[in-house]
């Protein structure tokens, strides 16, 4: 199956690659903007420059290009522990990450928010954090792993998920009959 | 098992207000981050909010910032949602899901989820 192509794919295609075709005449192709800049104004004609302006401190355009405007920097999302790890430039947009011994969490495929890395206290490390996750613990006997922490077994009740986890310490813990609330 | 039942969906005017609550059953509700999903008539699953489990830390997506409010009862097992201010593209079935952090994004364990539907 063909792909079906925007009007703008259609104009492109049909002009060699690093040009366009001119909005108003077809048979004319004018040279792409270098990332970094971009078109102020279309090439008068065939074998003439096309007209390309510096993006401004705040914008940038990260490849070749025939747009009207640059496209905004983003800013990183200090709420949700983000910092910037380098600057936006004419031709590359801000890089936002996350600080030392933390990992990201995407909540969308373009917003994340940065956690601690998990520690495993009473536990050793099975897989160290990485950007994109937490650590993996293996907990010591006596100690359950909930939510990627190392639990003492006296904090776990009958019927709860980490039963299986705690055997046979479970016998020896009291409250066994609750509702699994803690 | 792990259960979650929601409720409180229905038909609201676009400004109206709804609260919507997840019941939760077969897990240690506090230990979790939990929140609320949705997805609107043919498109994508997506994270409106999420709370801890304390309660202290939450996330909400740009679009419903400062019109949806996140909460639990971790006494009751219970998740809820204030939903005020609604607009036409709020209407999905949302669904209560748990969080699991790390990557994603993904949605976890999910509830079978209750209609929202906005018009006038």
């Known amino acids: 199956l063909v792909p079906h192509l925007g009007d703008r794919e259609k104009r492109d295609s049909v002009c060699p690659q690093g040009k366009y075709i001119h909005p108003q005449n077809n048979s004319i192709c004018c040279t792409k903007c270098h990332k970094g800049t971009y078109l102020y104004n279309d090439c008068p004609g065939p074998g003439q420059d096309t007209d390309c302006r510096e993006c401004e401190s705040g914008s940038f355009t990260a490849s070749e290009n025939h747009l009207r405007h640059c496209l905004s920097c983003s800013k990183c999302r200090k709420e949700m522990g983000q910092v910037e790890i380098s600057s936006c430039t004419v031709d590359r947009d801000t890089v936002c990450g996350c600080r030392k011994n933390q990992y990201r969490h995407y909540w969308s495929e373009n917003l994340f928010q940065c956690f601690n890395c998990s520690l495993c206290l009473n536990g050793t490390v099975h897989l160290s954090c990485q950007e994109k996750q937490n650590t993996v613990c293996t907990c010591h006997a006596g100690f359950f792993l909930r939510e990627n922490e190392c639990v003492s077994c006296s904090n776990c009740k009958k019927s709860l998920e980490c039963t299986k986890l705690c055997l046979p310490q479970i016998e020896n813990v009291k409250g066994t009959e609750d509702s699994g609330t803690t | 098992e792990v259960q979650l039942l929601e409720s409180g969906g229905g038909l609201v005017q676009p400004g109206g207000s709804l609260r919507l609550s997840c019941a939760v059953s077969?897990?240690?509700?506090?230990?979790?981050?939990m929140g609320w999903v949705r997805q609107a008539p043919g498109k994508g699953l997506e994270w409106v909010s999420a709370?801890?489990?304390?309660?202290?830390?939450?996330y909400y997506a740009d679009s419903v910032k400062g019109r949806f409010t996140i909460s639990r009862d971790n006494s009751k097992n219970t998740l809820y949602l204030q939903m005020n201010s609604l607009r036409a593209e709020d209407a999905a079935v949302y669904y209560c899901?748990?969080?699991?952090?790390?990557?994603?994004?993904?949605?976890?364990?999910r509830g079978q989820g209750t209609l929202v539907t906005v018009s006038s």
């Open positions: 077969g897990l240690t509700f506090e230990w979790y981050w």
């Open positions: 899901a748990k969080v699991k952090l790390g990557g994603g994004p993904n949605f976890g364990y």
């Open positions: 709370i801890s489990g304390s309660g202290g830390s939450t």
